[in-house]
Structure formats: structure tokens, C-alpha cells
């Protein structure tokens, strides 16, 4: 397993829709043909799988039907989106990179993004 | 190294707007956030919002929604903060300062606002 | 809103001495993001503390910080000359950010 740089934005604020996107790039040491990402939630100490999808280069990235993520890459850079986040998902959100094919296997961790949530205000009731 | 320089100070009256701008260097701007801090005269600080310079998307403290506006302009990594119907009880040093993993790691220098009639 | 308490109001201390600054939150802070700032006169704050326990940079170890959910603690275990100032602790975990109102550090 070789190291492998990942750079990704030190913080974003998520949209009033609870919608955040960051582009998490690689210095991709070879020419890789086959890469995962996975997006690792910390928060509270506690580290969790946010969703993971593996893709060949040239392609799009597929993650499974029912996950919050959706992405797309180009060259070495994945650009990411999570949606359904509410303030309590608040947190630090780290990229994981890995070179699956050709050998050597190479990883790659960001120091992760630490997203802001924002519930929206609700809207006061109107009487019509 | 890691600079926020800010604009010089206003004296507005009341009603009137101040728009304070808060240059960034010596780091990735749009990969952190921007606040905005202020300081009454021997008062504490009072944080106002933020700004993501990522994205744009902004959160304003309730009190100032409505009155205040932060933007940013990623080609002269430059954040601004905008302050409308002024009144005196809005007399006070403002700060803006980098939001990182780390909290507010870097800070302005501050921009007097005194709002006189 | 998380409401930050910091206690005492005014430290006054001798140069050498231990200073405990105490900075309650009105709810637990979320992932402990609770900063300690310090303030001198006519400057801007500066970053002493951050994740309630790791010093930022350039900040000399005789400051530290402990504490977890709503209770937390800066030390300063042998004061300094310069030390004398206003110290603020913030918690950046939940909208909005909030400071608390500050301990005034001065000489005895």
C-alpha cells in the first residue's frame, strides 16, 4: 500500500436545501484505470461510511441507488455532492481515495471538509 | 504567510450604508470561510455570520438578517461586508476573520464603523 | 442558540501564578468545537485553543485546554507579562457561532 496526496476544501457552508458539493482532488502517482472513493463522516469522535462508489477513469461514478451521493470526475478530481443534509449532519467530511487497478494499490486521505448545515427558518403560518 | 487586511475606517450617519472589505492571502481562498465579527466600544465580541467562499452561501446571524449582506470575490480573494440602515448602537470595531477546521484562525486587523449624526 | 457563561468575570493575578478560566455552554457543543481566544487592547483576538484541546500555532505551552459537552477549562499555568489580557471562548460547532463574554486577566 503506497501513500497518496488528497486535497479537498477546509470548509463549506451546505445550500438552504441541504445540498453540499466539494471536489476532492488526487495526485495520482501512475496511470490508475480503476479508483474508489468513499466519503467518511467524523463527528463527535465517531467515524462513518457517508457512501462509496468505485468507477473505471473515463467514467461516471456510480454510487448504489439509495445512497446521498452523487459525483462525477475529471482528470484526478471527483466532484462530489451530498444532499438530504440536515444541522444535525453537520460535520467533517473526508475523502478517501484509492487506486484499485493497475497495481501498486495506492491511498489517498484528505484532511477532510468540515460542511455546515443550516435548517431553514420555517415559515410562519398565513392565514388566508 | 496567512494575511486578512481590511479597509479603513468609516464614519456614516444614521440610515446609511458601510460596506467593509477583508483582503485575503497567503492561502487558498475559496477553501475556507469568512466571518464576521464585531466589537462595541468596551463591549465583547459579537459574532455576525459567515460567508463560505467555496460556494457563496451565506448565514446570517437572526438579529442582522435583512440588513446585512457578505459576499466574496474569489478573483481578488477579497470578502465584503455590507451594512444597511445604520444606527448608533452599530458604532463598533468590525472584524472579519478565516473560518477553518480550527475555528477562527486568522483574523483583520478591524475597521472602525461610527455611526454619528 | 448555545449560550456560552465564562467565569470569573475578572481574574486578578500575579505574574507567575496559575490562572482557570471556566466557559459553560448552555447545551452540549458539537465534535467539543469550542475555541479560546485572547484579546489585548486595541488588537484583534488571537486563536489560543481550538477542539477545546489542540494549540493553534505559535501558541507557547504554557496555555492549554480541557473540557467536553459544556463544560470546559483554559489554563495558563505559569502567567506571563503579555498574558494580561481579555480572553473569549466560542463554540463554532452549531449555527449560530457564539462567544461567550469574556474573562478580564488583570495584574493583582
Known amino acids: 500500500c503506497k501513500a497518496m496526496h488528497v486535497a479537498q476544501p477546509a470548509v463549506v457552508l451546505a445550500s438552504s436545501r441541504g445540498i453540499a458539493s466539494f471536489v476532492c482532488e488526487y495526485a495520482s502517482p501512475g496511470k490508475a484505470t480503476e479508483v474508489r472513493v468513499t466519503v467518511l463522516r467524523q463527528a463527535d469522535s465517531q467515524v462513518t461510511e457517508v457512501c462509496a462508489a468505485t468507477y473505471m477513469m473515463g467514467n461516471e461514478l456510480t454510487f448504489l441507488d439509495d445512497s446521498i451521493c452523487t459525483g462525477t470526475s475529471s482528470g484526478n478530481q471527483v466532484n462530489l455532492t451530498i444532499q438530504g443534509l440536515r444541522a444535525m449532519d453537520t460535520g467533517l467530511y473526508i475523502c478517501k481515495v484509492e487506486l484499485m487497478y493497475p497495481p501498486p494499490y495506492y491511498l489517498g486521505i484528505g484532511n477532510g471538509t468540515q460542511i455546515y448545515v443550516i435548517d431553514p427558518e420555517p415559515c410562519p403560518d398565513s392565514d388566508f | 504567510q496567512v494575511q486578512l487586511v481590511q479597509s479603513g475606517a468609516e464614519v456614516k450617519k444614521p440610515g446609511a450604508s458601510v460596506k467593509v472589505s477583508c483582503k485575503a492571502s497567503g492561502y487558498t481562498f475559496t477553501s475556507y470561510g469568512i466571518s464576521w465579527v464585531r466589537q462595541a466600544p468596551g463591549q465583547g465580541l459579537e459574532w455576525m455570520g459567515w460567508?463560505?467562499?467555496?460556494?457563496?452561501?451565506?448565514n446570517y446571524v437572526q438579529k442582522f438578517q435583512g440588513r446585512v449582506t457578505m459576499t466574496t470575490d474569489t478573483s481578488t480573494s477579497t470578502a465584503y461586508m455590507e451594512l444597511r440602515s445604520l444606527r448608533s448602537d452599530d458604532t463598533a470595531v468590525y472584524f472579519c476573520?478565516?473560518?477553518?477546521?480550527?475555528?477562527?484562525?486568522?483574523w483583520g486587523q478591524g475597521t472602525l464603523v461610527t455611526v454619528s449624526s | 442558540e448555545i449560550v456560552l457563561t465564562q467565569s470569573p468575570g475578572t481574574l486578578s493575578l500575579s505574574p507567575g501564578e496559575r490562572a482557570t478560566l471556566s466557559c459553560r455552554a448552555s447545551q452540549s457543543v458539537s465534535s467539543n468545537y469550542l475555541a479560546w481566544y485572547q484579546q489585548k487592547p486595541g488588537q484583534a483576538p488571537r486563536l489560543l485553543i481550538y477542539g477545546a484541546s489542540s494549540r493553534a500555532t505559535g501558541i507557547p505551552d504554557r496555555f492549554s485546554g480541557s473540557g467536553s459537552g459544556t463544560d470546559f477549562t483554559l489554563t495558563i499555568s505559569r502567567l506571563e507579562p503579555e498574558d494580561f489580557a481579555v480572553y473569549y471562548c466560542?463554540?463554532?460547532?452549531?449555527?449560530?457561532?457564539?462567544f461567550g463574554p469574556g474573562t478580564k486577566v488583570d495584574i493583582k
Open positions: 460567508i463560505s467562499a467555496y460556494n457563496g452561501n451565506t
Open positions: 476573520a478565516r473560518l477553518s477546521r480550527a475555528g477562527h484562525d486568522y
Open positions: 466560542q463554540q463554532y460547532g452549531s449555527s449560530p457561532f457564539t
